[in-house]
Interface confidence: low
Amino acid sequence: MRTEAQVPALQPPEPGLEGAMGHRTLVLPWVLLTLCVTAGTPEVWVQVRMEATELSSFTIRCGFLGSGSISLVTVSWGGPNGAGGTTLAVLHPERGIRQWAPARQARWETQSSISLILEGSGASSPCANTTFCCKFASFPEGSWEACGSLPPSSDPGLSAPPTPAPILRADLAGILGVSGVLLFGCVYLLHLLRRHKHRPAPRLQPSRTSPQAPRARAWAPSQASQAALHVPYATINTSCRPATLDTAHPHGGPSWWASLPTHAAHRPQGPAAWASTPIPARGSFVSVENGLYAQAGERPPHTGPGLTLFPDPRGPRAMEGPLGVR
């Protein structure tokens, strides 16, 4: 199931923007239709797994399905990071990883996914119905967050497929630029089509808009982007809420972490020009699963010359699902 953020409400364009080119007017709706089919919103998935060998150990895996560069990932539990949740780990693609007990090991799995092992007993131990949330700050999409918890009926050692969690939040301020143009175009197209349907011979007026083609297509919704923002955050069993995690992990990160607020992922950061991009930036994209992936080092056109795709500082665990986390 694909759960996607609702497109922000946009004011419909003024009446009379159909254009003055006779039948050529139909070109614009078709262009916009093409853009709408390829436009949409990113999504975040969360997978929670209880280890068979250690019943107090959880593995949380989160991934970002979008074409932008990730600038920060924040993992929290007890609810969303900005709404009462407690930060477990912060992962920065360039500056490293910091985690707090009971987080045992946080690491990048792939360029767009992370995993975190939690363990412990006592006050800070997770329990089966704890909610875990992952927030991805990315450029240019903005900040996206999803939450998930272990299904009540799950057997230890099993995990649900890493489908997008039914909770997704976007900072609308991050959906600008290309996305804004496309969203406006989609609304405009629907407006045109509706007017065209009701008026077999519309009166044409000079066009006052000229939607520009995006330099990179965003993700396309497979269904109408509706439910996600209407879904409330998952109910949290307060008996499983962890104590405030103010103890830094022994392997504390560099000094830059000290000044990093726990809500740092709330706003996207412009990523630096990360080194060691392993494959030539050819700017070629392959359309898959209703969207685009920047394949194997090819730089998304919208990132600009100074925004190369980053390598994982600990080495990606390359599309290997829940495996291999020791």
Epitope: E109, D312, R317, A318, M319
Partner: antibody, heavy 117, light 107 residues
Framework: QVQLKESGPGLVAPSQSLSITCTVS????????IKWVRQPPGKGLEWLGT???????DYNSALKSRLSISKDNSKSQVFLKMTSLQTDDTARYYC???????????WGQGTLVTVSA | DIQMTQTTSSLSASLGDRVTISCRAS??????LNWYQQKPDGTVKLLIY???RLHSGVPSRFSGSGSGTDYSLTISNLEQEDIATYFC?????????FGAGTKLELK
């Protein structure tokens, strides 16, 4: 451009050890995992192990006691060492990179190792 | 270990044909299924990863689908250069395991 090249001894006597080097270019070993895979003649592929960007390793449990994977980031080289070889270890040995989060994204051409007296 | 089964060890087809190669996992692998092409000279290339995502530089005639335990690779318009052996591989659980391969031949 991503390139991987394996170099090995070609022929190894039974009970001896095998050492293969994978030399990479086009990316940094500190950021990406390298996997080792082998293929006996006329048979399928078998994953041997992985060394990650941070130096941690995963091994195929069936071979773990005989395998060791290490690397030298500065030389862009990854090393596979396998001990106590037997004739059924005869295979083409490949290294493959996990470039940008894609499993076995790029492969070397492989090096054929024959275990024979 | 998760067993990957490619029931068809060899397949004959004509140029231009639509060819489908199947792969079954012994348990749910959550879409962590990748397809590789091995040419007769031993060269191996990744075609598709995570069930349906096309790797860089792979022609669009290749596509993948499936979920749970059953997956397939489809070549929509077979070309001469596609004559090779195709392997599936699961990346959901260690050890990583491959199917035995399906050899594609010309009729």
């Amino acid at each position: 451009q991503v390139q991987l090249k394996e170099s090995g001894p070609g022929l190894v006597a039974p009970s001896q050890s095998l050492s293969i080097t994978c030399t990479v270019s086009g990316f940094s070993l500190s950021g990406y995992g390298i996997k080792w895979v082998r293929q006996p003649p006329g048979k399928g592929l078998e994953w041997l192990g992985t060394i990650w960007g941070d130096g941690s390793t995963d091994y195929n449990s069936a071979l773990k006691s005989r395998l060791s994977i290490s690397k030298d980031n500065s030389k862009s080289q990854v090393f596979l060492k396998m001990t106590s070889l037997q004739t059924d270890d005869t295979a083409r040995y490949y290294c493959a990179s996990d470039s940008l989060g894609i499993t076995f994204g790029y492969w070397g051409q492989g090096t054929l190792v024959t275990v024979s007296a | 270990d998760i067993q990957m089964t490619q029931t068809t060890s060899s397949l004959s087809a004509s140029l231009g044909d639509r060819v489908t190669i199947s792969c079954r996992a012994s348990q749910d692998i959550s879409n962590y299924l990748n397809w590789y092409q091995q040419k007769p000279d031993g060269t191996v290339k990744l075609l598709i990863y995570y069930t349906s995502r096309l790797h860089s530089g792979v022609p669009s005639r290749f596509s993948g689908s499936g979920s749970g335990t059953d997956y397939s690779l489809t070549i929509s318009n077979l070309e001469q250069e596609d004559i090779a052996t195709y392997f599936c591989q699961q990346g959901n659980t260690l050890p990583l395991t491959f199917g035995a391969g399906t050899k594609l031949e010309l009729k």
